[in-house]
């Protein structure tokens, strides 16, 4: 039995898989900040985790995925306000009893030092200094991401 949040993640991922591949993004759009090979957009309002997930998708983006500790630190360096929390694309999968990124991969336990419990209806937020487990219904800001990728022409087999 999947939670409503897990269903939401899966639905968004499946709909993304169905869409035709867009050409790669060479530069960050206006209002987005570049961080290495990503473009980040920080919200100016607050939402629970699933609303944040949905809102990023309206911008043809996803909630932030963090590859490793190094990327976490670089992202945190962009956060100017000490006490502000931001949702990222990581929540607790009850069925798999593990932290799961919205792209379907599981958290490598060495990547993030999470403060708080790993339990049902828990989602991950970051601040300028830390990573927290929060109730997914908590209303905080969030970070969307787009990947910067070189343009690659997709080769289709002859029909």
């Amino acid at each position: 039995q999947k939670s409503s949040i897990e269903k939401c993640s899966v639905d968004i991922q499946q709909s993304r898989n169905k869409t035709t591949e867009r050409p790669g993004l060479l530069n960050c759009p206006i209002y987005w900040q570049q961080l290495r090979e990503k473009c980040l957009l920080f919200s100016h309002t607050v939402n629970p985790w699933n609303n944040s997930l949905a809102d990023c998708s309206t911008k043809e983006s996803s909630l932030l995925l963090i590859r490793d500790k190094d990327e976490l630190i670089h992202t945190q360096n962009l956060i100017r306000d000490k006490a502000i929390l931001f949702w990222i694309g990581l929540n607790f999968s009850l069925s798999e009893k593990n932290w799961k990124w919205i792209n379907g991969s599981f958290l490598n336990s060495n990547d993030l030092e999470i403060r708080g419990d790993a339990k049902e209806n828990s989602c991950i937020s970051i601040s300028q200094t830390s990573v927290y487990s929060e109730y997914c219904s908590t209303e905080i800001r969030w970070i969307c991401q787009k990947e910067l990728t070189p343009v690659r022409n997709k080769v289709y087999p002859d029909s």
């Epitope: 209002y31 920080f42 100016h44 309002t45 607050v46 939402n47 629970p48 209303e139 800001r141």
Partner: antibody, heavy 120, light 107 residues
């Protein structure tokens, strides 16, 4: 067209509370975050906080955190700002202002303002 | 908190003049700066966002520029309806702050 219509002027005694309303029309009320900004007589503008009408989530300027409460009633597309333990320096015009974009902090439409006078 | 200092506080000018108002931030705010116009007894009206992007319906005589800590609002040819008070605002941090205002008066 977008309109934000606020409640009328109020006169309050120090220590009392005031609740100002802001009725939205001409757009989807739950689609835009509402902010509150005040302006003391002859002074500049001061941001007080925000409410997301869709979820009810709030975020307040630390200066007002212990005294302000922002709420909304989606059935009548109205946002409210209540300020308690009023002091004479709370005398100001209070504006509701719509956040123009979830990802940028500008206010594209404003209410006409509500004058709150705090006097003994 | 990020402080915004506007100069001048008062400015006298005539119809047809070109005027420039400056807004200085106490810290780097990138281009997260907004300009508003306010007339007596009225609410502020959005003119410019992101330092230089005119809001829908704002006449082209209004332009904004700058990044980092110094920003300007320029009115290329003053019209009678432009006499008002102008405010800058930053949203680089989540504690939004406003400048003290520049009152533009008829000479």
């Amino acid at each position: 067209q977008v309109q934000l219509v606020q409640s009328g002027a109020e006169v309050k005694k120090p220590g009392a509370s005031v609740k100002v309303s802001c009725k939205a029309s001409g757009y989807s009320f739950t689609g835009y975050t509402m902010n509150w900004v005040r302006q003391a007589p002859g002074q500049g503008l001061e941001w007080m906080g925000l409410i997301n009408p869709s979820s009810g989530g709030t975020y307040y300027n630390q200066k007002f955190k212990d005294r302000v409460t922002m709420t909304r009633d989606t059935s009548i597309s109205t946002a409210y700002m209540e300020l308690s333990r009023l002091r004479s320096d709370d005398t100001a015009v209070y504006y509701c202002a719509r956040l123009g974009d979830n990802y940028r902090g500008y206010f594209d439409y404003w209410g006409q303002g509500t004058t709150v006078t705090v006097s003994s | 908190d990020i402080q915004l200092t506007q100069s001048p506080s008062f400015l006298s000018a005539s119809v047809g003049d070109r005027v420039t108002i400056t807004c200085r931030a106490s810290q780097d705010v990138g281009t997260a700066v907004v300009w508003y116009q306010q007339k007596p007894g009225k609410a502020p009206k959005l003119l410019i966002d992101w330092a230089s992007i005119r809001h829908t319906g704002v006449p082209s005589r209004f332009s904004g520029s700058g990044s980092g800590t110094e920003f300007t609002l320029t009115i290329s040819s003053l019209q009678p309806e432009d006499f008002a008070t102008y405010y800058c605002q930053q949203y680089s941090t989540y504690l939004y702050t406003f400048g003290g205002g520049t009152k533009l008066e008829i000479k």
